[in-house]
């Protein structure tokens, strides 16, 4: 899987948008790691 | 209204350093990363690195590792690139950009500084 | 590095014209690609991303398809405003790359 901070920035805007933006506020591409996915 | 302002054009001597701004707005800066991308006259873009504002890690195209240095003033919500022994060749347009989630899902870019360096 | 090849480099078309440019990877990058228009004096301005979705606010006469080494950018009707030059960008290895160009000129 992508891990360059393009792909987790796009992998965590689906998230978002799938979850309704309804996760933690400190969910955001600079504090995920790939880990997250 | 997200914004990433750059600084003014610039005109260096060979083998001198330049420091080029990224003034950002309208977002929270420590939560995306920053990119660098230049462009020749005429020529491709070319990515140079990025940066975590959040912790400060970087990643750079090998082609300008150590000579190209990416920071970040939290505080002013600024990102900076810096390039050392500049020579004929890093005449170019500099641009930097951060892929944005909210408030708006977007791909912003900064409007560019020129770099030109001539003895 | 990974290689773009961007074709053609240039193409003249009119207003209402089907445009195809097409980009191909020297390996697999999945679909991290995205695509920019650029005008001249201007930043590039990001049209799409993940190979096939579109940016909000962008015209849905752009589509971009693939997945792998190959990759599409169609504008399906060339708008006045469209004439420009199209770069594609993997975005899957460090370093990002970018495909050469293409020149999209009036006929």
């Known amino acids: 899987s992508c891990n360059t901070a393009t792909c987790v920035t796009h992998r965590l805007a689906g998230l978002l948008s799938r979850s309704g933006g309804v996760v933690k506020d400190n969910f955001v591409p600079t504090n995920v790691g790939s880990e997250a996915f | 209204e997200v914004q990433l302002v750059q600084s003014g054009a610039e005109v260096k001597k060979p083998g001198a350093s330049v420091k080029v701004s990224c003034k950002a707005s309208?977002?929270?800066?420590?939560?995306?990363?920053m990119n660098w991308v230049r462009q020749a006259p005429g020529q491709r873009l070319e990515w140079i690195g990025d940066?975590?504002?959040?912790?400060?890690?970087?990643n750079y195209n090998q082609k300008f590792k150590g000579r190209a240095t990416l920071t970040v003033d939290k505080s002013a919500s600024t990102a900076y690139m810096e390039l050392s022994s500049l020579r004929s060749e890093d005449t170019a347009v500099y641009y930097c950009?951060?892929?944005?989630?909210?408030?708006?899902?977007?791909?912003?870019w900064g409007q560019g500084t020129t770099v030109t360096v001539s003895s | 590095d990974i290689q773009m090849t961007q074709s053609p480099s240039s193409l003249s078309a009119s207003v209402g014209d089907r445009v195809t440019i097409t980009c191909k990877a020297s390996?697999?990058?999945?679909?991290?690609v995205a695509w920019f228009q650029q005008k001249p004096g201007k930043a590039p301005k990001s049209l799409i991303y993940?190979?096939?979705y579109r940016y909000s606010g962008v015209p849905s006469r752009f589509s971009g398809s693939g997945s792998g080494t190959d990759f599409t950018l169609t504008i399906s009707s060339l708008q006045p405003e469209d004439f420009a030059t199209y770069y594609c960008?993997?975005?899957?290895?460090?370093?990002?790359?970018f495909g050469g160009g293409t020149k999209v000129e009036i006929k």
């Open positions: 950009a951060s892929i944005i989630i909210v408030p708006n899902y977007f791909d912003y």
């Open positions: 309208g977002y929270t800066f420590t939560d995306y990363y």
């Open positions: 940066i975590n504002p959040n912790t400060g890690g970087t």
């Open positions: 390996q697999n990058v999945d679909t991290n």
């Open positions: 993940s190979a096939s």
């Open positions: 960008q993997q975005y899957n290895n460090y370093p990002y790359t």
